[in-house]
Interface confidence: medium
Amino acid sequence: HKCDITLQEIIKTLNSLTEQKTLCTELTVTDIFAASKNTTEKETFCRAATVLRQFYSHHEKDTRCLGATAQQFHRHKQLIRFLKRLDRNLWGLAGLNSCPVKEANQSTLENFLERLKTIMREKYSKCSS
């Protein structure tokens, strides 16, 4: 069967997100991938969306992230825009209303996004073959 258009959009967004550092891509998020052995794919997507939502809700107006130059400000706004898009698309793939996220292991946002990108690319290669 063909790959979901949402999946392609997620990979595209993740590629954009992981291309550049901002002042806040090194801030830390809950690492939902550390203990995801007994977790369904839909639960993983749901938890990933929850983590991203927590991040952008907390840091959208964080002065450290907005920076002090026009370039830093623009890059942060772009980061938040991409995270919101990713959040929306992940919810679409998950098809779940909510999911628990335990505050356990920590990962930087950039590492979290790289891990998510690997998972999504694997999923894409399976559905496109």
Partner: nanobody
Framework: EVQLLESGGGLVQPGGSLRLSCAAS????????MGWARQAPGKGLEWVSW????????YYADSVKGRFTISRDNSKNTLYLQMNSLRAEDTAVYYC?????????WGQGTLVTVSS
Amino acid sequence: EVQLLESGGGLVQPGGSLRLSCAASGFTFRNFGMGWARQAPGKGLEWVSWIISSGTETYYADSVKGRFTISRDNSKNTLYLQMNSLRAEDTAVYYCAKSLGRFDYWGQGTLVTVSS
């Protein structure tokens, strides 16, 4: 366990300089953005400066821009804040911080008093 230990505070005259240090342990220092915040007597916490792991991106609050310089030595797990042209309004407890997303790890703080 994350530990952040600030030092270098003290009493200084207006126009003077101080260099704050923050010794970090309990985590891989070179992987994380770090920063300084301060709390003046009777006021809220204010972010002063922030630096990413590589040191290539920095943030400064408008109130300290051009006077303060943040830097880090990843080989020594140490964060620095060079403070020049100090003013009375810079008097505060200065905290070293490692942010964990919605959670921040803070040091105990070091007091900087600018007075003649």
